[in-house]
Interface confidence: low
């Protein structure tokens, strides 16, 4: 019968001679050269050669276990004289023994990962994996241990799983957003002499709302003409927020001040500015300065960061109302006067008064719009507004006179106002009756 054990052969042999595998031997072999050993199967005659007299097998080439771990061959022992087999053909195995000739290789050259800023220590970031082509069933050639080469003390890696976790408290995106971590995978359980490979992990801290809005200045001042209609924007304020996205969104509100009912603030969603607008008609003569307290706040707040302080800030907004030069204002919308038809020339009928409503109280002069009094029947004292006749009247000719009086600011002739005057001519018995006279 055949006499051998399973053959083992170390891979990656570097010797100058052929590598000895083992010996095929039949108990029928008496050592007299009467038997001939024949090898067939995987690599026979090429990779593996046999001394047909002695049964010694040698490998002619360097073998790579990772390419082929097992070779299955067949052995024959033939009687040289008869040409007959002295043993039944038998299959045998050459098993290639592993050496540590493969370094761990990561599944990706570069990994990309994100983790929220300010995460607790130990927060999962990403798992990296390296594989080793060596034999995992024998020795530690394929036992991979992970370690961090660059990226401490921010991140750590679990040596057995390749799970990267945060290693520092309060990692702040606003201070630093990008981290490049280099992870090493080393075989032989990380021991000396192990082979290693590395990968880069680009980690980005994603934003959380850990920063409140902050006004860059405590006081703002804007001016607006008193003529600004409701809805007019009069100024923009902007609080800055170091966060990004919805964490940096800001809402503005007026929380206090004399102008609470006079102004509004709206948030410009695009620029994240607060736009102060006029809410009610302003009047310089009534109030010249308003002081508001405007608040900027984050609409989306993370409760766990409330200990950092309120997620809002306030600023004082001072609004100065600008005077707009307004025309004189008459004491009445219209005047109705009466005069007897027998009034003498220069008889005073009445008077009108107008006043500059501006704080300057500019003096006013009066005149009659001659388009409304072509016959120049009436006149006005330009200084005091007294209306008097400049011609004799006749009720029978015209019962009502409708004229317009103009009031003009002396210092600013562009500012003028008009008012209608309705003058009624009262009847005087100055006409004899007319009729047909008949004789007796």
């Amino acid at each position: 019968s055949w006499m051998w054990n399973q053959f083992f052969l170390l891979e990656e042999y570097t010797g100058s001679d052929y590598q000895y595998v083992g010996k095929l031997h039949s108990d029928q072999d008496r050592g007299d050269g009467s038997l001939k050993y024949i090898l067939s199967g995987d690599g026979a005659g090429d990779l593996f050669i046999i001394n047909e007299n002695t049964g010694d097998i040698q490998a002619t080439k360097r073998l790579d276990r990772e390419e082929k771990p097992v070779y299955i061959l067949r052995a024959q022992a033939i009687n040289r004289r008869t040409g007959r087999p002295v043993e039944p053909e038998s299959e045998f195995i050459i098993k290639i023994h592993d050496i540590n000739d493969n370094e761990p290789i990561f599944t990706k050259e570069v990994y990309t990962a994100t983790v929220p800023e300010m995460s607790d220590v130990g927060t999962f970031v990403v798992q990296v994996t390296a594989t080793d082509a060596d034999d995992p069933t024998y020795g530690n050639s394929a036992k991979v241990v992970y370690s961090i080469l660059q990226g401490q003390p921010y991140f750590s890696v679990e040596s057995e799983t390749g799970i990267i976790k945060t290693a520092l408290l309060n990692m702040d995106r606003e201070n630093r957003e990008q981290y490049q971590v280099v992870i090493q995978a080393k075989d032989m359980g990380g021991q000396m002499g192990g082979l290693s490979g590395t990968t880069t992990v680009n980690i980005t801290l994603t934003d959380v709302n850990d920063n409140p809005p902050r006004f860059p200045q405590s006081t703002y001042q804007f001016k607006t003409p008193e003529s600004s209609p409701p809805g007019t924007p009069i100024g923009r304020i902007k609080a800055s927020d170091a966060d990004v996205g919805e964490n940096a969104e800001i809402e503005y509100s007026i929380t206090d001040g004399e102008g609470l009912d006079m102004f509004d603030v709206i948030t410009d969603q695009e620029t994240q500015e607060g736009i102060i607008t006029v809410k009610k008609l302003l009047d310089f003569e009534k109030k010249k300065v308003y002081t508001l307290k405007v608040e900027a706040s984050n609409p989306y707040v993370e409760p766990r960061f409330l200990y950092l302080g309120p997620f809002k800030d306030s600023a004082t907004v001072r609004i100065v109302v600008e005077d707009v030069d307004e025309p004189p204002v008459f004491s009445k919308l219209a005047y109705i006067l009466q005069i007897r038809e027998d009034a003498q020339i220069n008889t005073t009928i009445g008077s009108v008064t107008a006043q500059d409503p501006d704080a300057a109280r500019n003096p006013v002069k009066y005149s009659v719009d001659r388009h409304t009094d072509m016959d120049r029947i009436f006149n006005i004292d330009s200084g005091n507004g007294s209306i008097f006749t400049s011609k004799l009247l006749d009720r029978e000719t015209l019962l009502w006179h409708n004229i317009t009086v103009i009031a003009t600011e002396i210092n600013n002739p562009k500012q003028s106002s008009r008012v209608p005057l309705y003058i009624k001519v009262l009847d005087v018995n100055d006409n004899a009756p007319t009729g047909l006279s008949t004789g007796a």
């Epitope: 003390p153 921010y154 309060n170 990692m171 702040d172 201070n175 630093r176 280099v182 950092l308």
Partner: antibody, heavy 122, light 106 residues
Framework: EVQLVQSGAEVKKPGASVKVSCKAS????????MHWVRQAPGQGLEWMGW????????EYNQKFQGRVTITADRSTSTAYMELSSLRSEDTAVYFC???????????????WGQGTLVTVSS | DIQMTQSPSSLSASVGDRVTITCKAS??????LAWYQQKPGKAPKLLIY???TLQTGVPSRFSGSGSGSDFTLTISSLQPEDFATYFC????????FGQGTKVEIK
């Protein structure tokens, strides 16, 4: 804009103590480490220690252990460095410097105070 | 403790020259290195961090390279305002500065 403004120059006798201040503005004082670095005339820079104003924890260079005390006043956003038992070789410009990271006493220094000259002479 | 060795300790150059300063760490510090510029009577100013990242506002003629234990600061075309002392600093483990390189006018 981040600013660190230090107190003025000091002249001290050997054996005395000196306390240098560093007032911070333009950022949340409690959220960044504050370091102290000194530079002897014509010499290089030497790290002395840090404080985390958020909780007052400190770390000192072994060389100065027992002689240096770093404190912080959160109400005024001011850090202080006190060096005792002064000797002539302590003559140097003392700088405060903000650590770039909020939650880590490592890293580089992104903003520096203007420096305070301390002269130790008898 | 990690020691930082800077070379040369001083150099003379002219405006427009390319200037290279090297810094060697006593052990592997990966890319945990910063470069600072200091002018007489002034505080150091951060130029480069993480070995090769330019600090905001620093002119692009400054660049940093290196990893592990050997690092270089390069000024591609020296300007009049660049005459100063340059320090490297490691922050891999604690803090240590190089002894400085003074760049003087030739």
């Amino acid at each position: 804009e981040v600013q660190l403004v230090q107190s003025g120059a000091e002249v001290k006798k050997p054996g005395a103590s000196v306390k240098v201040s560093c007032k911070a503005s333009g950022y949340t004082f409690t959220r960044n480490f504050m370091h102290w670095v000194r530079q002897a005339p014509g010499q290089g820079l030497e790290w002395m220690g840090w404080i985390y104003p958020g909780d007052g924890e400190t770390e000192y260079n072994q060389k100065f252990q027992g002689r240096v005390t770093i404190t912080a006043d959160r109400s005024t956003s001011t850090a202080y460095m006190e060096l005792s038992s002064l000797r002539s070789e302590d003559t140097a410009v003392y700088f405060c410097a903000r650590g770039v990271y909020g939650g880590f006493a490592g890293g580089y220094f992104d903003f520096w105070g203007q420096g305070t000259l301390v002269t130790v002479s008898s | 403790d990690i020691q930082m060795t800077q070379s040369p300790s001083s150099l003379s150059a002219s405006v427009g020259d390319r200037v290279t300063i090297t810094c060697k760490a006593s052990q592997n510090i990966y890319k945990n290195l910063a470069w600072y510029q200091q002018k007489p009577g002034k505080a150091p100013k951060l130029l480069i961090y993480d070995a090769n990242t330019l600090q905001t506002g620093v002119p692009s003629r400054f660049s940093g390279s290196g990893s592990g234990s050997d690092f270089t600061l390069t000024i591609s075309s020296l300007q009049p305002e660049d005459f100063a002392t340059y320090f490297c600093q490691q922050y891999y483990s604690g803090w240590a500065f190089g002894q400085g390189t003074k760049v003087e006018i030739k």
